[in-house]
């Protein structure tokens, strides 16, 4: 009787099924949708949790302009196609053979196409900025107080290291946070910045990810931090290949 | 990035054998875990067998005795006999680049899978 199997289950995502019938009494949590194994001390990969929740069941400004090629994601939910690590494969298509091409945070970055389109590589999402209004308060909050706590934030609870977290600026109410991670930077190990950024518009929506704790609680110097707004733009290492059309509508 | 392709699948009377191999690239494949995963129609997937980079073997009582796991690093390549098969073992069968954490069992990656069909 080990103590795996007197705690199995999966801290990161509690979209998983968990049985301490691993090797050797281990125990093994399973992600919904895709059946893998997830590492349970870390973040588990957007593409997986995505797989998950989709078979689930139904339930002087100091701010940053983002530049022309910031993609949000307006497609919303899908159902995507992951790799064999878990993560999103460069094309993506639907049950009725549409297709179009993704970014490693699963956003679509060109226009869709039938089952002849190509994506030649999964392009990296190499900056994120996190775009939040607070609700109104008696005053500001302190700017380095407010970067502090956010900083903590992703460092403690989605494991990102530190040096990925670019910049926390505010200008009340608003409130961004720039992430950035280059292929080169990132290495075995590190939490990528797509999956602490969705795991933290989850927490922001009151959709934890985490297994068995409280929703997210934002102080900042014991003020309650409550966002009424997000918006997240991702910035690719290439550029997107939409239409003209798309990009004058 | 990792790739991981199965073969040796197919269709066998029950008490039969099978060998299923793995070809493995984009990754130190003599330094890596690796294991064997089932998943049957209708139900969720089980591993079946677990190698350590060391050698080490694991196995589930459901196939403990009939079923080896083995690799030859040379190769990058794992392998599965299955001996004395049953119809309950009919399903796809898919190799796993894995770990062993203090506490859980981890697949860091898996192929596509190969089918394995027990019947006469």
């Known amino acids: 009787h080990t103590a795996a199997q007197d705690n199995c289950t999966c801290p990161t995502n509690k979209m998983t099924v968990c049985s301490p019938d691993g090797p050797g009494g281990r125990c093994q949590c399973r992600a919904l949708g895709s059946g893998m194994a997830v590492d349970c001390s870390t973040l588990t990969s957007k593409c997986l949790l995505l797989k998950a929740r989709m078979s689930a069941p139904k339930n002087a400004r100091t701010l940053v302009r983002p530049s022309e090629h910031a993609l949000v994601d307006n497609d919303g939910l899908y159902d995507p196609d992951c790799d064999p690590e878990g993560r999103f494969k460069a094309r993506q298509c639907n049950q009725t053979s549409v297709c179009w091409c993704v970014n490693s945070v699963g956003v679509r970055r060109t226009d869709k196409g039938d089952l002849s389109l190509r994506c030649d590589e999964l392009v990296r999402t190499h900056h994120i900025l996190i775009d939040l209004r607070h609700r109104p308060t008696a005053g500001a909050f302190n700017h380095s107080d407010l970067d502090a706590e956010l900083r903590r934030l992703f460092r403690e609870r989605y494991r990102l290291h530190p040096k990925f977290v670019a910049a926390v600026h505010y200008e009340q109410p608003t409130i961004q946070i720039e992430l950035r991670q280059n292929t080169s930077q990132k290495a075995a190990g590190d939490v990528d910045i797509g999956d602490a950024a969705y795991y933290f518009e989850r927490d922001i929506k009151g959709e934890s990810l985490f297994q068995g704790r409280g929703g997210l609680d934002l102080r900042v110097r014991g003020e309650p931090l409550q966002v009424e707004r997000t918006l997240i733009y991702y910035l690719d290492e290439i550029p997107p290949k939409f239409s003209m059309k798309r990009l004058t509508a | 990035q990792v790739q991981l392709q199965e073969s040796g699948g197919g269709l066998v009377q029950p008490g039969g054998s099978l060998r299923l191999s793995c070809a493995a690239s984009?990754?130190?494949?003599?330094?890596?875990?690796m294991s064997w995963v089932r998943q049957a129609p209708g139900k969720g997937p089980e591993w079946v067998s677990y190698?350590?980079?060391?050698?080490?073997?694991y196995y589930p009582d459901t196939v403990k005795g009939r079923f080896t796991i083995s690799r030859d690093n040379s190769k990058n390549t794992l392998y599965l006999q299955m001996n004395s098969l049953k119809p309950d073992d009919t399903a796809v069968y898919r190799c796993?680049?894995?770990?062993?954490?203090?506490?859980?069992?981890?697949?860091?990656?898996w192929g596509q899978g190969t089918q394995v069909t027990v019947s006469s």
């Open positions: 796993a680049k894995s770990r062993l954490t203090d506490s859980h069992y981890v697949e860091d990656a």
């Open positions: 984009g990754f130190t494949f003599s330094g890596s875990d």
């Open positions: 190698i350590t980079s060391g050698g080490t073997t």
